[in-house]
Amino acid sequence: IVLRPSRVHNSEENTMRALTLKDILNGTFSYKTFFPNWISGQEYLHQSADNNIVLYNIETGQSYTILSNRTMKSVNASNYGLSPDRQFVYLESDYSKLWRYSYTATYYIYDLSNGEFVRGNELPRPIQYLCWSPVGSKLAYVYQNNIYLKQRPGDPPFQITFNGRENKIFNGIPDWVYEEEMLATKYALWWSPNGKFLAYAEFNDTDIPVIAYSYYGDEQYPRTINIPYPKAGAKNPVVRIFIIDTTYPAYVGPQEVPVPAMIASSDYYFSWLTWVTDERVCLQWLKRVQNVSVLSICDFREDWQTWDCPKTQEHIEESRTGWAGGFFVSTPVFSYDAISYYKIFSDKDGYKHIHYIKDTVENAIQITSGKWEAINIFRVTQDSLFYSSNEFEEYPGRRNIYRISIGSYPPSKKCVTCHLRKERCQYYTASFSDYAKYYALVCYGPGIPISTLHDGRTDQEIKILEENKELENALKNIQLPKEEIKKLEVDEITLWYKMILPPQFDRSKKYPLLIQVYGGPCSQSVRSVFAVNWISYLASKEGMVIALVDGRGTAFQGDKLLYAVYRKLGVYEVEDQITAVRKFIEMGFIDEKRIAIWGWSYGGYVSSLALASGTGLFKCGIAVAPVSSWEYYASVYTERFMGLPTKDDNLEHYKNSTVMARAEYFRNVDYLLIHGTADDNVHFQNSAQIAKALVNAQVDFQAMWYSDQNHGLSGLSTNHLYTHMTHFLKQCFSLSD
């Protein structure tokens, strides 16, 4: 059981107050984290509270401002990037968001040696992506879908690609589906370790069907937004990978990296690129039917002036029980010999673990094992491997950092974080300096988050970087809800849940229950993290019990649970939420006449199906930006879990798993359907089709749209959304306003 330390004593009760909705909407109780911007083994940059860019040297204890807030303000910079030779800084301003990761901006180059902005050969605007080379001060940038190279910031640019075209050909940046569902970045170019080569992806979207929606704006006529967006079964982008020698870019030009024959024989994806050395690169490819992944190690052949990917350096990863990997196929972390690597994939028992691959995947040496999962490899040095896992005390929703000594035999394992601040910190991530000389630990909870700096050899804590003292003080007079994380054992399935309980929770009383669900494949909702959010308010002020349940399809508990939903989305995720609700009712403190469910995105899909399950368990529910049919969602994501919507593949389940097919079952529940009209991700089409089906079935429901809002419903829409949902739930639960 994880209980938030209670600060409620009878004598203090009258000075304590419950959370308000306003607290949540104002972000009153938000926390800070500290991630050093490492620039060497012992130095990092950090933007101070007054917006100076300060360089810290851990070993000398000295710090100095490298860029003043005055310089930042002179171009309204919101971000910066120091060149590795420390001669220049780029300043980023005019940030303009595009999709989840992508944005455009204006860039200015500031010369630290003379304290002036670089004049002459200024960068065009707006730029889609810009980055320094890893050594020196070469610049690569993407402008109007083409890649440019500068040897020095003041030099004229060398144009690498010429075929870039809006919505057609993307060079060095991903198209919509690669950005959202495969790379999870705004960029698709990668410098080699010493900046000799620049690799980039070219995405050809010429034949992809386009999603079009209205953007109403303020003009007389709405604009139409057009995005090449492959839905399930549609034509996909065609990807090619090129590498150019940045020292002699005009010599042979960009050289295409060959696709492994077994991948190229049918539709495929490029999934990631990892540089090993300046003359060795590792590419990962994935068949469109995403159960086969190939990792290909390619060498630069000076005699060919191109890249050689011998079959002997192809490593195949295949899943026979589901899709390849977790959410994504894991990426390799290469060791110092520049050919062997460490990688997370399923072991013979179906748990994701670290393996060491020297020659073939078949001969891989398993490094971690157990009925838990290795989650991320942070760093491999000559003698240590740092990784995170959820092994400690068998709580899948925790993250601790471990060190394995790989320099000694047999390797020894040490948990770096397990006993540091055991009650406060059970969910960590880490950020390492060069050669792991030092590292920062960022603890996300369950207590108030704290960031600390550590010695990479001894693991000794050097200093606290951020401990959120102001937040701690602000919370002293707040009645926070209690939280507990426990598990249910049902039919050989373990269902972990988090329950958020009102501050004066009394087991002998009855409380309304709200299920918050996401439930998407390879997700995890039950995590030992700190949060003061809308559901905290609902428990604290409105006296609701809120529960989050990780059912089948969720991550980090083995392949049996994860791959249970393969090819049948919308079945077990819903079943497991319903099963959990029944178990909660049995606990005796739930008012079974006042149970609701809500979710966003995939959670909106699950909540809709749960409401339409015909169980009579739910009085009401909310779906925000739900998927309503898998035929409407992106190919890369959907087909990973569902296969293709064709007769000879899985069309039948595509049709059976829609929300619309269950329209009749909404008759006995109160349903609130919410969607942004400019949702580029889960298109408004999804909710439009639910609404149409409900109208056609003559079923009453409530709905709210947010004009020109995307999948995140940000800004003022957020306030309106949570206010609206609060009213809906309070009405459903007969709670007075």
Partner: antibody
Framework: QVQLVQSGAEVKKPGASVKVSCKAS????????IHWVRQAPGQGLEWMGW????????KYAQKLQGRVTMTTDTSTSTAYMELRSLRSDDTAVYYC?????????????WGQGTLVTVSS | EIVLTQSPGTLSLSPGERATLSCRAS??????????MHWYQQKPGQAPRLLIY???NLESGIPDRFSGSGSGTDFTLTISRLEPEDFAVYYC?????????FGQGTKLEIK
């Protein structure tokens, strides 16, 4: 037109060293790899290694590693191959050859050859 | 290393005849893009001369009676109608892997 002109014949004693030169003309010297290939009397061709004048990259055949050194002088567009600790079985005609731009490993122009005789 | 075996060792033919020379590699010298096999001609007292590069591409200035074919491990040099000046030693060479290797040569002699 492309030409590779090699230095003259050499007679060396076992244990000595020899340095053969190869002067290039008719093209941009730095752009192409220079290979060295040898041919013992009445025998086939044996690849010794290459040097890339632009990058300074050098690859040697395993069996000659430690005894051979390839260098270039870009100011004179000349490549050099030095072989040390000569043995009688090093007696051969030594060729320099230009790496063909599109050939990806084919040698499109050859020097006339330098006969090195190792004899006591 | 990749071993190249040429056959026959000696080929005796008359001018005007068709010559077929073979080269077999101990492992594939092809990728999805190219076959890294090249052919040279060497006459006594002369340096080798490039005839065919990347298995089938005719080097400029070489008569079109010379042609190359093959992929993977088996390659062929064909001279469609032998001319008197074609009688020489022919070598195949691979650049698929380092070290580069040559075949032992096929001697084409006048019958």
């Amino acid at each position: 037109q492309v030409q590779l002109v090699q230095s003259g014949a050499e007679v060396k004693k076992p244990g000595a060293s020899v340095k053969v030169s190869c002067k290039a003309s008719g093209y941009t010297f730095t752009e192409n790899i220079i290979h060295w290939v040898r041919q013992a009397p009445g025998q086939g061709l044996e690849w010794m290694g290459w040097i890339h004048p632009a990058s300074g990259s050098i690859k040697y055949a395993q069996k000659l590693q430690g005894r051979v050194t390839m260098t270039t002088d870009t100011s004179t567009s000349t490549a050099y191959m030095e072989l040390r600790s000569l043995r009688s079985d090093d007696t051969a005609v030594y060729y320099c050859a230009r790496h063909g731009g599109t050939g990806r490993g084919a040698m499109d122009y050859w020097g006339q050859g330098t006969l090195v005789t190792v004899s006591s | 290393e990749i071993v190249l075996t040429q056959s026959p060792g000696t080929l005796s033919l008359s001018p005007g005849e068709r010559a077929t020379l073979s080269c077999r590699a101990s492992q594939s010298v092809s990728t999805s893009a190219y076959s890294y096999m090249h052919w040279y001609q060497q006459k006594p007292g002369q340096a080798p001369r490039l005839l065919i590069y990347l298995a089938s591409n005719l080097e400029s200035g070489i008569p079109d009676r010379f042609s190359g074919s093959g992929s993977g491990t088996d390659f062929t040099l064909t001279i469609s109608r032998l001319e008197p000046e074609d009688f020489a030693v022919y070598y195949c060479q691979q650049s698929r892997e380092l070290p580069y290797t040559f075949g032992q040569g096929t001697k084409l002699e006048i019958k």
